[in-house]
């Protein structure tokens, strides 16, 4: 069914997400030691490293056109904190209408 | 045609349970495309969201900071219904409390509204 | 919480009228932002979405516009019917808050 071709789809984006940190962090000097907030997949999209002060925006990931194909793709903010990542905002639910592969409710 | 049918009390002490239910017709409380919302209104503080809840393979509740304290919703699957509970209730409580389900098209918006409840907390 | 203001609080208008009314976001809101028309005594009713978006069965003559903090709601040829209070609410982030209303009475 369409979940199981969309678990398909988030697994592929996973692996080229953690590609695409790998290739951020050689460009920005970055790592395991270094401040700021390492790159991320959280179980939707992709979040390029950041340094501390940053705000990151992503649209919400293309897959949500299958569940919503109306969906004029909103977007999500985090920001890097001292503290690390804070929260999506707004969450996934507001902001793209599913939130079926977000670890956090 | 979806409908909300409201039901419950129109008078509540001060420091009980205000108890309310929104019985579903039309659509199902386990839908996977809706959300079940609880709005209030006062003169004092116009139309005010107080919460939601929602099945995407489980439960999910979000709700007011201003009543986080004291609200439970809770479906209840066997009647396609879910409820409304707010504990500690002050004459501040009184409104019309409306039951809504949410639809997402773009962003959530609230397409069908139940009938409303007036509820008075008084001694 | 994102406050929701809006303006005039009351209008008062005549049949055939077109009047706009204003609502504005505290923060950007992108066009996460809904219009309901409420009448004496009766729940509100969704007229438009997603700021611009017509809810079916609405007539034509009810428009939006706006993204970011500031938002119209038109009504082209103002009938009989119209004459209500009017409520923006933002979705872009709970809790989904409602502005004050704007009430539409009879000149």
């Known amino acids: 069914g369409s979940m199981a071709h969309s678990d398909g789809i988030f697994k592929k984006e996973q692996a080229m997400c953690l590609e695409k940190i790998q290739r951020a962090n050689e460009l920005m000097g970055f790592n395991d030691s270094s401040p700021g907030c390492p790159g991320m997949w959280d179980n939707i999209t992709c979040w390029k490293p950041a340094h501390v002060g940053e705000m990151v925006l992503v649209s919400c990931p293309e897959l949500f056109r299958i569940f919503n194909p109306d969906q004029d793709m909103g977007v999500v903010s985090r920001n890097c904190t001292e503290d690390g990542w804070s929260e999506p905002f707004p969450h996934y639910f507001d902001a793209c209408g599913f939130d079926e592969y977000e670890s956090e409710t | 045609q979806v409908q909300l049918q409201q039901s419950g009390p129109g008078l509540v002490k001060p420091s009980q349970t205000l108890s309310l239910t929104c019985a579903i017709s039309?659509?199902?409380?386990?839908?996977?495309?809706?959300?079940w919302n609880w709005i209030r209104q006062s003169p004092s503080r116009g139309l005010e969201w107080l919460g939601r809840t929602y099945y995407r393979s489980k439960w999910s509740n979000h709700y007011a900071v201003s009543v986080k304290s004291r609200i439970t919703i809770n479906p209840d699957t066997s009647k396609s219904q879910f409820s409304l509970q707010l504990n500690s209730v002050t004459p501040e409580d009184t409104a019309v409390y409306y039951c809504?389900?949410?639809?997402?098209?773009?962003?959530?918006?609230?397409?069908?509204w139940g009938q409303g409840t007036l509820v008075t907390v008084s001694s | 919480d994102i406050q929701m203001t809006q303006s005039p609080s009351s209008l008062s208008a005549s049949v055939g009228d077109r009047i706009t009314i204003t609502c504005r976001a505290s923060?950007?809101?992108?066009?996460?932002l809904n219009w309901y028309q409420q009448k004496p005594g009766k729940a509100p009713k969704l007229l438009i979405y997603?700021?611009?978006s017509l809810q079916s069965g609405i007539p034509s003559r009810f428009s939006g516009s706006g993204s970011g903090t500031d938002f119209t709601l038109t009504i082209n040829s103002l009938q009989p019917e119209d004459f209500a209070t009017y409520f923006c609410?933002?979705?872009?982030?709970?809790?989904?808050?409602f502005g004050p209303g704007t009430k539409v009475d009879i000149k």
């Open positions: 809504a389900r949410g639809t997402w098209k773009q962003l959530w918006f609230l397409d069908h």
């Open positions: 609410q933002q979705s872009y982030s709970p809790p989904f808050t």
């Open positions: 923060q950007s809101i992108s066009r996460y």
């Open positions: 039309g659509d199902s409380v386990s839908s996977n495309s809706a959300t």
């Open positions: 997603a700021a611009s």
